[in-house]
């Protein structure tokens, strides 16, 4: 019979329940915002905001300074005091809505939910490798802010995203805020605005450009700003908003808004719908054409990509790509398919689609009925007309007004549904060597570090570990500090190495040494670790072979047995070709001669499972004793593979040498035509891999084999006669003299 090694699931080579402890900081309240600073003189800091407090941490996450940011009206509020004697507004807690660095100065800017959403500028004072905050500047000039026109009212209690850009000698704040009717009526924050920080840090210059949801839509049309970033000549905001001003407001989709980073103008404000789908390789019956839509963006991050992913996305290495985690709806619960999907949108492609959309709107011939869109911000109009106007006047340009691009940008899940039930709540993408890694936080407080590739049917994990014991969701915003990422979960900030927290979750030497170079994993005799964990025995160049099973478990003391060994690190080459003299198998004292691979039996093994097979012919030595013994595989002088060479010995117990004994045969006669069912009784009749019952030298076809009994059908006889009957096990005759008599039919 053709025995095959059982497959070992790929997951068996790793253990994601391994506990990793990473540095952390307890902030004393739910973390509301976090940002990092790295100076050019080796000084660095982590700024962590909770309700009514701003913490300054050193690079080791130890507290350096703490500043009271509220409650407003409380004499202990240190930021409030910077605005001079109050009262400045209704008293109340300060929830930090904005925490950003002004890179030009550099300085930290914080804006809260109290005091009309005003901001504070905190000068950074390097002190060795740490940073302190100087006394805050109140970015609010009382005399030029009114409820209906307030350049210094920045943060909305419903959420605000800010990206700071240096233009010329000034810092411009690109601000996007979620509004409703109540918020809009109170000191008039705007949906999207570009505000210049005045040189004297007394606030923002009046007369700034802005777009706001029109009053009639404020009740039903809410825009959530999920992420903002600056790359190249543009600032981008990512939003989740109703797909239509007129239809069901709960039908949401995701948009990208693009603003010029070189001109503080909103005439070239553009929006583009981002469409992310899960398109399984085999489509279920009833599944939508083009894949299942995942319209709601949960988190996003943009980063330059490594060579491999760049090739898959048909872009150049190092090009900026926007990555987004999408879900099916606000609650995140899917019907069928994974909970979260990840789509990749190359920035250059986004820009091209936007520019083509502008051409379609503004270059003749314009498709009739093509709408300018953004009816929640501006009066409806058809291209190429400006908002609210029937036609272009000679001194206006179609291009100088905001526009929703008429086509969407559609992509499919990079992970092909493999995130399954995981609910991703945080995302940061890095390029390590030529590998692009997604660092993801989850709803249940885990960190997943996974290579971003689209061509596989399994996930390539750098790590998958729990941040702590609380199991609280990892928050959306992630910051980088040197070679670490900072994730927040509950009231804690965690510092996770970009290279992964360690290597102990890789259980086998092969998996360990196949890990990415940047992880710094090596084998320490019986575990995978980084060099600092086991400096004495740590090595990265070889793995011993690993025997996990063999077949059969017994063989005849006389005669050969075809032994199949199962395990890993036998070959390192898919072909399984073994150079002469590299593999030595012994069973007890007896050698087992390697057999060439039977190419007809080679079967592709998906990387999700792995198993290696090795076959050899066991011919026991004359000195070999009956009884249990070990199987030993030694590999030496193997040419190195891509990741390591195989070198070493693996021993497995449980093989027994046995002597088959034939005790009885019946019946001892039968028709000359053959077909008599012979029963051979004895002991150890099933040992080894081959046996044959010979009647007058012709094989008696075996029907059943067991340890104590063989059944076979006799072949036809040439003549009526008594003929010799023998049993061979492993090609060697079992002692005993038996005859079978052919009779007339």
């Amino acid at each position: 019979e053709d025995w095959q090694c059982p497959r070992t699931p790929y997951a068996a080579s790793r253990d994601f329940d391994v506990k990793y402890v990473v540095p952390s900081f307890s902030a004393g309240g739910l973390v509301q915002a976090m940002v990092t600073y790295e100076g050019d003189r080796n000084e660095s800091a982590v700024f962590v905001a909770i309700r009514n407090r701003l913490h300054v941490l050193g690079p080791d996450l130890k507290s350096v300074q703490s500043l009271a940011t509220g409650p407003a009206g409380d004499p202990g509020c240190q930021t409030c005091a910077a605005c001079g004697p109050g009262p400045h507004g209704p008293p109340g807690d300060t929830d930090t809505k904005v925490l950003v660095l002004d890179p030009a100065l550099p300085a930290l800017v914080s804006c809260g939910s109290s005091l009309q959403g005003r901001c504070f500028l905190h000068d950074l004072e390097p002190q060795g490798t740490a940073v302190h905050l100087a006394a805050p500047a109140c970015l609010f000039s009382a005399h030029h802010n009114r409820p209906d026109d307030c350049p210094d009212c920045v943060a909305s209690p419903l959420g605000t995203r800010v990206t700071v850009v240096e233009q010329g000698q000034a810092s411009y704040f690109y601000v996007a805020s979620s509004l409703d009717a109540a918020v809009a009526a109170s000191f008039s924050p705007r949906s999207v605005s570009i505000r210049r920080l005045k040189a004297d840090a007394s606030g923002f210059a009046p007369g700034f450009v802005a777009l706001s949801v029109l009053p009639k839509h404020l009740v039903s049309y809410s825009i959530e700003y999920v992420h903002s970033f600056h790359t190249g000549a543009f600032v981008y905001f990512l939003t989740v908003q109703p797909a239509s001003v007129t239809d069901d407001p709960s039908a949401l989709h995701t948009r990208l808004a693009r603003l010029s980073a070189t001109e503080p103008e909103l005439g070239d404000y553009r929006e583009l719908v981002l469409d992310c789908r899960f398109a399984p390789k085999r489509r279920r019956r009833g599944a939508p054409e083009g894949g299942q839509p995942y319209p709601v963006l949960r988190v996003a991050h943009s980063a330059p990509v490594g060579a491999q992913l760049a090739t898959e996305l048909s872009i150049a290495e190092g090009q900026e790509v926007l990555f987004g985690v999408f879900v099916t709806g606000k609650d995140g619960g899917p019907g069928v398919g994974p909970n979260s999907v990840v789509c990749a949108f190359p920035i250059d492609l986004l820009d091209t689609l936007i520019d083509e959309g502008v051409e379609r709107c503004c270059e003749s011939p314009v498709h009739p009925g093509l709408r300018r869109g953004l009816d929640f911000f501006q009066s409806p109009s058809f291209c190429p007309n400006p908002p609210g106007l029937e036609a272009l006047s000679p001194n206006t340009s179609c291009r100088h007004f905001p526009l929703l691009v008429s086509s969407s940008f559609s992509r499919v899940d990079l992970f092909n549904g493999l995130l399954g039930p995981v609910q991703v709540t945080a995302l940061y993408v890095t390029r390590l060597d030529n590998v692009t890694v997604a660092h993801m936080g989850t709803m249940d407080g885990r960190i997943l570090q996974v290579e971003l590739v689209r061509s596989l049917n399994y996930l390539l994990y750098v790590s998958n570990f729990s941040l702590g014991d609380s199991g609280q969701p990892v928050q959306r915003d992630v910051s980088r500090l040197g070679d670490h990422l900072l994730f927040a979960s509950g009231d804690q900030v965690f510092q996770v190495p970009i290279q992964g927290p360690g290597c102990r979750h890789f259980l086998t030497c092969g998996r360990c040494l196949r890990a990415w170079h940047f992880m710094g994993c090596g084998w320490c005799g019986n575990m995978c670790g980084q060099q600092k964990e086991c400096p004495g025995s740590w090595q990265q160049d070889h793995c011993p072979p690993k025997l996990t099973e063999f077949h059969p478990h017994s063989g005849p003391l006389r005669g050969s047995t075809r032994l199949t060994l199962c395990g890993s690190n036998f070959y390192l080459h898919p072909s399984g070709l073994v150079p002469e003299g590299t593999h030595q198998v012994t069973v007890g004292q007896s050698p087992c001669r390697p057999l060439p691979k039977d190419s007809s039996k080679l079967r592709p093994v998906p990387r999700k499972d792995f198993v290696e097979e090795f076959e050899c012919e066991l011919e026991p030595l004359g000195t070999q004793a009956v009884g249990p013994t070990n199987v030993s595989l030694t590999v030496t002088n193997m040419p190195p593979g891509k990741h390591f060479r195989v070198d070493g010995t693996s021993v497995l117990r449980g093989f027994s040498f046995m002597e088959p004994v034939l005790i009885a045969v019946q019946p001892l006669f039968g028709p000359r035509a053959g077909g008599t069912c012979l029963t051979l009784e004895g002991q150890s009749l099933s040992v080894g891999t081959s046996r044959a019952v010979l009647v007058n030298g012709t094989e008696c076809l075996l029907a059943r084999v067991s340890e104590g009994q063989l059944l076979c059908a006799t072949p036809p006889g040439a003549t009526v006669a008594s003929v010799p009957l023998s049993l061979q096990v492993g090609g060697a005759q079992v002692p005993g003299s038996w005859t079978f008599q052919y009779r007339e039919d």
């Epitope: 100076g39 910077a82 100065l105 100087a134 005045k198 004297d200």
Partner: antibody, heavy 121, light 107 residues
Amino acid sequence: EVQLLESGGGLVQPGGSLRLSCAASGFTFSDYQMEWVRQAPGKGLEWVSYIYSSGGKTVYADSVKGRFTISRDNSKNTLYLQMNSLRAEDTAVYYCARLPRVGATIINDYWGQGTLVTVSS
Amino acid sequence: DIQMTQSPSSVSASVGDRVTITCRASRGISSSLAWYQQKPGRAPKLLIYAASSFHTGVPSRFSGSGSVTEFTLTISSLQPEDFATYYCQQTDSFPLTFGGGTKVEIK
């Protein structure tokens, strides 16, 4: 007591270079933004250059951009102005001035007594 | 760049007089304006910042007002030590710029 003492002025030929220094004392120099302001003989004040407390941001008047470089050494409590490709119109008394910390507003709350730079052949 | 235009360029007045100096910005600077006093051979001294806030130790006869583009410095009752040149400076955006100065002379 806050003190700012400029030095390094003098006579220089057109096209030449000069480096002005401003030694600060009586306050934590690294906490403050600093600037240079000049005054040509018998003329008004002209703002020249600004440097942020950390030295991260520098700004120049158009008239000196590309020729002058402002810098600071916080460990030595000193502000510098490197002046290259000097012209006759750069002749002036150069004042070093301290700006209040961010938290107040950018107005010069302390000035040095000035150092005279004369550019002439 | 923001141009600052000061007027008059000079004014003759007597002790006890009320003197008003105007400063106009070429574009809106809200209240980002400072006033300085300079005596011959001396460094300038800060009088007013943020258009109307007194610097420490400045006598109350000096006051500043105005916003956006129009600003004034008023000396309510001129004293002998007030004869000097006065400069305005905008602090709204870089490059920071000064007005041309107003010389207050003894009549």
